[in-house]
Amino acid sequence: ESALITQQDLAPQQRAAPQQKRSSPSEGLCPPGHHISEDGRDCISCKYGQDYSTHWNDLLFCLRCTRCDSGEVELSPCTTTRNTVCQCEEGTFREEDSPEMCRKCRTGCPRGMVKVGDCTPWSDIECVHKESGTKHSGEVPAVEETVTSSPGTPASPCSLSG
């Protein structure tokens, strides 16, 4: 319904940079690594290392690449079709319910519990009761046993956008 600005209408600094390749949309959609132009006639490539798009889309703008926080390591860089993959540093993990930050893994299990799972970038150490074998998901106890954990080996990346 609304007409859109053409590239000619844009100020020089707003025009697509020469390296931004163009192609025509297919049924109104642009391929991954591109966004649609204001007039809907062109697909404009995202800027490598700056923004990206992962799916066929009719987005006016590519999505900004995630920047890994301090306390995270970059497993793979942002490309025009895939966001940066960040992972918590050794000895820290990211919980599903608080994905904004990496938290320190506990160094050991509470008394009466044994460690059955190592610290990984996506989970704290896992403790179970010696007798019952039930898991413990509580906070760091006031008193810990001398059983300590070594940071786990990364198995799969944890990707977070924004």
Epitope: L4, I5, L10, Q13, Q14, H35, I36, G40, Q50, D51, N57, D58, L59, L60, F61, C62, L63, R64, S161, G162
Partner: nanobody, 124 residues
Framework: QVQLVQSGGGLAQAGGSLRLSCVAS????????MGWFRQAPGKEREFVAA????????YHADSVKGRFTISRDNAKDSVYLQMTKLKPEDTADYYC?????????????????WGQGTQVTVSS
Amino acid sequence: QVQLVQSGGGLAQAGGSLRLSCVASGRTFTNYAMGWFRQAPGKEREFVAAINWSGDSTYHADSVKGRFTISRDNAKDSVYLQMTKLKPEDTADYYCASAESFSRGGLPYGMNYWGQGTQVTVSS
């Protein structure tokens, strides 16, 4: 969570100007594209303008092209809508929104957040 607080609406004469502001807090402002929408009484919401995360790409609807300008100041976590040559048909409640991007039809992509709205009345 992102909080968006709007200001700058009010009453203007036809042919006059107004500037709307929207200040964001709560998350990294530069991760988001920003948009302005409006809704007149008894009408559907209309996509007015949008700007990408870096501020180097903008969209303006045909109905406001040449009269309204969207801009952003990432240092101030703010987005603006400069409205000039106002017409009575610009009378509406104006809302700012943040999203990862916006579709050509004005659909926000990804997590999106909205301002509280500000009223703009243009008298003839």
